[in-house]
């Protein structure tokens, strides 16, 4: 038997993904465990295997369709539910009902570049990845920027309050190494949060020209 | 303005059949479910059928059988295809549709349509 607290949280990507993680205190080590999703108007049915991601919390992905099929709506809830083997049983271990659509978070933002760069500012553009069409454009960024000294925690964040997939970074150091990072979040869902921060972007500013400022 | 208007409802015998229409109209939308609720006076409104993306039809369990949901998305219209009705299926039917408007989920009523069946 298992005692201690247990706590089991899921996000929907908005499109065909639902990514879970559960942690237990006193957790079973050896033990197989899975997620298995069950909607409650939907002909298919979906598990993953539990995999540790620290001493006691496991994660997996619910692979729900082709990455961009629109698998779930609002009115879809999917129950959700911890099953570890115990002998020959399977145990629940925790359960949830879950509303896609208020728990959201997207894929992180990829294929970043650099449009442009000069000696103070830099161009920079992404992509979202399997964001619903529900929301349209509807969408808003966070970005922050390395600079050299500090930790990502120190960067100020920039908040772009519309689906815009680049940024102008002024006031720069010329000939400085930077990285930079972006993340997405739908305006839809009490329980949704912003999505993982991209791949860091490293880029270099242009050094001075001599004798002038560019 | 989103509107959603019904039609269709009307006084029919026992055994009979009947057809409920409902568009919906207005600034720009995309809908992720449409579906029909009924109401009868004392009680709380009920699904009679909905459906969502995806093609996934619900029913409530006193009509599974005898009622079909058909939703056209390019139309933006919902029809309630109603069989073998009998008296307990009277009441007003109303049209509900969950709209996404600039990023936001929210859902919308119609007025409803008056369904009489007599024995």
């Known amino acids: 038997a298992v005692n201690g607290t247990s706590q089991f949280t899921c996000f929907y990507n908005s499109r065909a993904n639902i990514s879970c993680v559960w942690s237990q205190d006193g957790a079973l080590q050896d033990t197989s465990c899975q997620v298995h999703a069950w909607p409650d108007r939907r002909r298919w049915n979906q598990t993953c295997e539990l995999l540790p991601v620290s001493q006691a919390s496991w994660a997996c992905n619910l692979i729900l369709g082709a990455p961009d099929s629109q698998k779930l709506t609002t009115v879809d809830i999917v129950t959700l539910r911890v099953l570890c083997r115990e002998g020959v049983r399977w145990r629940v271990m925790a359960i949830q009902d879950f509303k896609p659509f208020e728990n959201l978070r997207l894929m992180a933002p990829i294929s970043l570049q650099v449009v442009h760069v000069e000696t103070h500012r830099c161009n920079i553009s992404w992509e979202i990845s399997q964001a619903s069409h529900y929301f349209e454009r509807h969408l808003e960024f966070e970005a922050r920027t390395l600079s050299p000294g500090h930790t990502w925690e120190e960067a100020p964040l920039l908040t772009l309050k519309q689906k815009q997939e680049w940024i102008c970074l002024e006031t720069l150091t010329p000939d400085t190494q930077y990285e930079f990072q972006v993340r997405v979040k739908p305006l839809q869902g009490e329980f949704t949060t912003w999505s993982p921060w991209s791949q860091p972007l490293a880029f270099r500013t242009k050094p001075a020209a001599l004798g002038k400022d560019t | 303005e989103v509107q959603l208007v019904e039609s269709g409802g009307t006084l029919v015998q026992t055994g009979g059949s009947l057809r409920l229409s409902c568009v919906v109209s207005?600034?720009?939308?995309?809908?992720?479910?449409m579906g029909w609720y009924r109401q009868v006076p004392g009680k709380q409104r009920e699904l009679v059928a909905d459906?969502?993306?995806?093609?996934?039809?619900k029913y409530g369990d006193s009509v599974k059988g005898r009622f079909t949901i058909v939703r056209d998305s390019v139309k933006n219209t919902v029809y309630l295809q109603m069989s073998s009705l009998n008296p307990e299926d009277t009441g007003v039917y109303y049209c509900?549709?969950?709209?996404?408007?600039?990023?936001?989920?929210?859902?919308?009523w119609g007025q409803g349509t008056q369904v009489t069946v007599t024995s």
């Open positions: 509900k549709a969950g709209l996404w408007i600039k990023g936001r989920h929210s859902d919308y």
């Open positions: 207005g600034s720009h939308f995309i809908s992720d479910v």
């Open positions: 459906m969502a993306d995806g093609g996934s039809a």
